[in-house]
Interface confidence: medium
């Protein structure tokens, strides 16, 4: 799981955008990926990175019985 996320995050070279990806990866079932992404005001590149990483991480967890995937700062 972590390898796959790192692979996706590596696409984002800008540190701010990369952080947006990691923010999306963090487990948060208070709202869906789309709902959370809609609240981001940093900019469209951040929204795109957040959404892609959030959805991929959620799908990976769904295929792995939702084991925790806590990626760092």
């Amino acid at each position: 799981l972590q390898e796959k996320i790192e692979e996706i995050a590596a696409k984002y070279k800008h540190l701010v955008v990369k952080k947006c990806c990691y923010d999306g990866v963090r487990i948060n079932h208070d709202e869906t990926c789309e709902q959370r992404a809609a609240r981001i005001s940093v900019g469209p590149r951040c929204v795109k990175a957040f959404t892609e990483c959030c959805v991929v991480a959620s799908q990976l967890r769904a295929n792995n019985s939702h084991k925790d995937l806590q990626l760092g700062r």
Partner: antibody, heavy 119, light 112 residues
Framework: EMQLVESGGGLVQPGGSLRLSCAAS????????MQWVRQAPGKGPEWVGL??????????QYAASVKGRFTISRDDSKNSVYLQMNSLKTEDTAVYYC??????????WGQGVLVTVSS | DIVMTQSPLSLPVTPGEPASISCRSS???????????IDWYLQKPGQSPQLLIY???NRASGVPDRFSGSGSGTDFTLKISRVEAEDVGVYFC?????????FGQGTKLEIK
């Protein structure tokens, strides 16, 4: 191990105000949404509201029954979330729980604090 | 708001026998990220609610394997394969697919 500890409950007259606090520990507080849920005596739980983490704006959302009267705030430097309750009504009498989806999936609940609104 | 309809509201069970609780939502709780946004909680007398099942079918850490959750979309079920005396309390489902989160009415499980 994550822990949520509420404080500030008590007896207040209708129309009065009260501020509840929730001290969190055992997780990276600033990364997570924080919520309040209440439970009136003999009833089921009722969602009160939430405050989002800064990554998605730190905004708040409330149940229709408390909107305009209750305010949720957070202080990430103190790992604390607050519920300011104004214009309290007798129907606000309940045990108030601080809850979060930090740590394990699903909601983790504090021990709860009783708020009694009565004259 | 999404309405959660839980049944039965009262459930008398003989120890060792199975038990089943249903929760039906007025809208689908399955999001495009593949997750069913529903939890099951047990509130024992005088205690805070405790998580049993998340995501519709994932057993929380420390929860005995006699508890299981199933379903997707709008219909969900919590099953206890063999009820024990310590299982008494009120069981709630909770949807968090959309704000505001909404709870089922609760099912009071009691031992016959």
């Amino acid at each position: 191990e994550m822990q949520l500890v509420e404080s500030g409950g008590g007896l207040v007259q209708p129309g009065g105000s009260l501020r509840l606090s929730c001290a969190a520990s055992g997780f990276t507080f600033s990364d997570y949404y924080m919520q309040w849920v209440r439970q009136a005596p003999g009833k089921g739980p009722e969602w009160v509201g939430l405050i989002r983490n800064k990554a998605v704006g730190g905004t708040t959302q409330y149940a229709a029954s408390v909107k305009g009267r209750f305010t949720i705030s957070r202080d990430d430097s103190k790992n604390s979330v607050y519920l300011q309750m104004n214009s309290l009504k007798t129907e606000d009498t309940a045990v108030y729980y601080c809850v979060s989806r930090a740590g394990p999936p699903g909601l983790s609940w504090g021990q709860g604090v009783l708020v009694t609104v009565s004259s | 708001d999404i309405v959660m309809t839980q049944s039965p509201l009262s459930l008398p069970v003989t120890p060792g026998e199975p038990a089943s609780i249903s929760c039906r939502s007025s809208q689908s709780l399955l999001a495009s990220d593949g997750y069913n946004y529903i939890d099951w909680y047990l509130q024992k007398p005088g205690q805070s609610p405790q998580l049993l099942i998340y995501g519709g079918s994932n057993r929380a850490s420390g929860v005995p394997d006699r508890f299981s959750g199933s379903g997707s979309g709008t219909d969900f079920t919590l099953k206890i394969s063999r009820v024990e005396a310590e299982d008494v309390g009120v069981y709630f489902c909770l949807q968090h697919r959309a704000l505001p989160p909404t709870f089922g009415q609760g099912t009071k499980l009691e031992i016959k």
